[in-house]
């Protein structure tokens, strides 16, 4: 699932339903903002790479209190093949930044919106 | 609201080219796709291709490559496809329409350009 | 490529009814499958996505179904203004393909 670049011809291959309905959950929450999100919480920056999902859980878990990205919180557990708990964090973060959730949100549908056009556009 | 507006109907002499545009408001530009359609009474609704307006990728059905060049300009939010070495079978009604990922369905559709190649 | 073949051509029908349209692909495409109307001179409007999601603004009259490659839209009680052409599109790889669409007319 973390593997999206690269596609085979003679084209992109659409994502699975959990992806695709992952992704959706990004746009309406990017879409439908209008008080800052999670109440402006901030978070610990990602490298968007290979264990991006385990790691995008690892920073969104310490948000909590906040039903507008629970659903992203769910849907990235069933994309992590571990137990994922606060305070828990994996070398894939950027330790030294953090940034709001509703920029870590954005990030990570661009990240995905990057990986499937790569596959797509030449 | 999110709107895709297309230039003007065009009357074009065979092997001639022109440039049509859709310019988009109401959304983030480069947060879409633009595909392109082609609706002829034969050949009904046909893609032609999309671009990425971030990279400016493409990608295009082989059925038009060499026939469609889509381009577009971040900066006036618009989107242009010109048509090369016209012939009668170009002439349609030419949409843009825009789509998140490919995969996504076509929420938005412009009003529609008419082409008419005729001498 | 994949071939979206819609049945039936053309559909008369009485104000009220319920009716069925009918798209099947040449290959399966899981619920990659839209619909849309276009009324006369008008540009094409989206109805159902992922073949039975509902869009915001549209009547629930309309309604989808279907997976795999065999898909209905049905508009469960007709309205005069549903008159037009019906088209199913293929989402799940490129090129993007329709049907030839399904013109709904009024008896």
């Known amino acids: 699932l973390t593997c999206l670049g690269g596609f085979a011809s003679p084209g992109p291959v659409p994502p699975s339903t959990a992806l695709r309905e992952l992704i959706e959950e990004l746009v309406n929450i990017t879409q439908n903002q209008k008080a800052p999100l999670c109440n402006g919480s901030m978070v610990w920056s990602i490298n968007l790479t290979a264990g991006m999902y385990c790691a995008a859980l690892e920073s969104l878990i310490n948000v909590s209190g906040c039903s507008a990205i629970e659903k992203t919180q769910r849907m990235l557990s069933g994309f992590c093949p571990h137990k994922v708990s606060a305070g828990q964090f994996s070398s894939l973060h950027v330790r030294d930044t953090k940034i709001e959730v509703a920029q870590f949100v954005k990030d990570l549908l661009l990240h995905l919106k990057k990986l499937f056009r790569e596959g797509q556009f030449n | 609201q999110v709107q895709l507006q297309q230039s003007g109907a065009d009357l074009v002499r065979p092997g001639a080219s022109v440039t049509l545009s859709c310019k988009a408001s109401g959304y983030t530009f480069i947060d879409y796709e633009i595909h392109w359609m082609k609706q002829t009474p034969v050949h009904g609704l046909e893609w032609i291709g999309a671009?990425?307006?971030?990279?400016?990728?493409?990608a295009y059905n082989q059925k038009f490559k060499g026939k469609a060049i889509l381009t577009a300009d971040k900066s006036s939010s618009t989107a242009y496809m010109e048509l090369r070495s016209l012939t009668s079978e170009d002439s349609a009604v030419y949409y843009c329409?825009?789509?998140?990922?490919?995969?996504?369905?076509?929420?938005?559709w412009g009003q529609g350009t008419s082409v008419t190649v005729s001498s | 490529d994949i071939v979206m073949t819609q049945s039936p051509a053309t559909l008369s029908v009485t104000p009220g009814d319920r009716v069925s349209l009918s798209c099947r692909a040449s290959q399966n495409i899981s619920d990659y499958l839209h619909w849309y109307q276009q009324k006369s001179h008008e540009s094409p409007r989206l109805l159902i996505k992922?073949?039975?999601q509902s869009i915001s603004g549209i009547p629930s009259r309309f309604s989808g179904s279907g997976s795999g490659s065999d898909f209905t839209l049905s508009i469960n009680s007709v309205e005069p203004e549903d008159v037009g052409v019906y088209y199913c599109?293929?989402?799940?790889?490129?090129?993007?393909?329709l049907g030839a669409g399904t013109k709904l007319e009024l008896k």
């Open positions: 671009i990425d307006p971030e990279t400016g990728g493409t």
């Open positions: 599109q293929n989402g799940h790889s490129f090129p993007l393909t």
């Open positions: 992922y073949a039975s």
């Open positions: 329409t825009r789509i998140l990922l490919y995969y996504y369905p076509m929420d938005y």
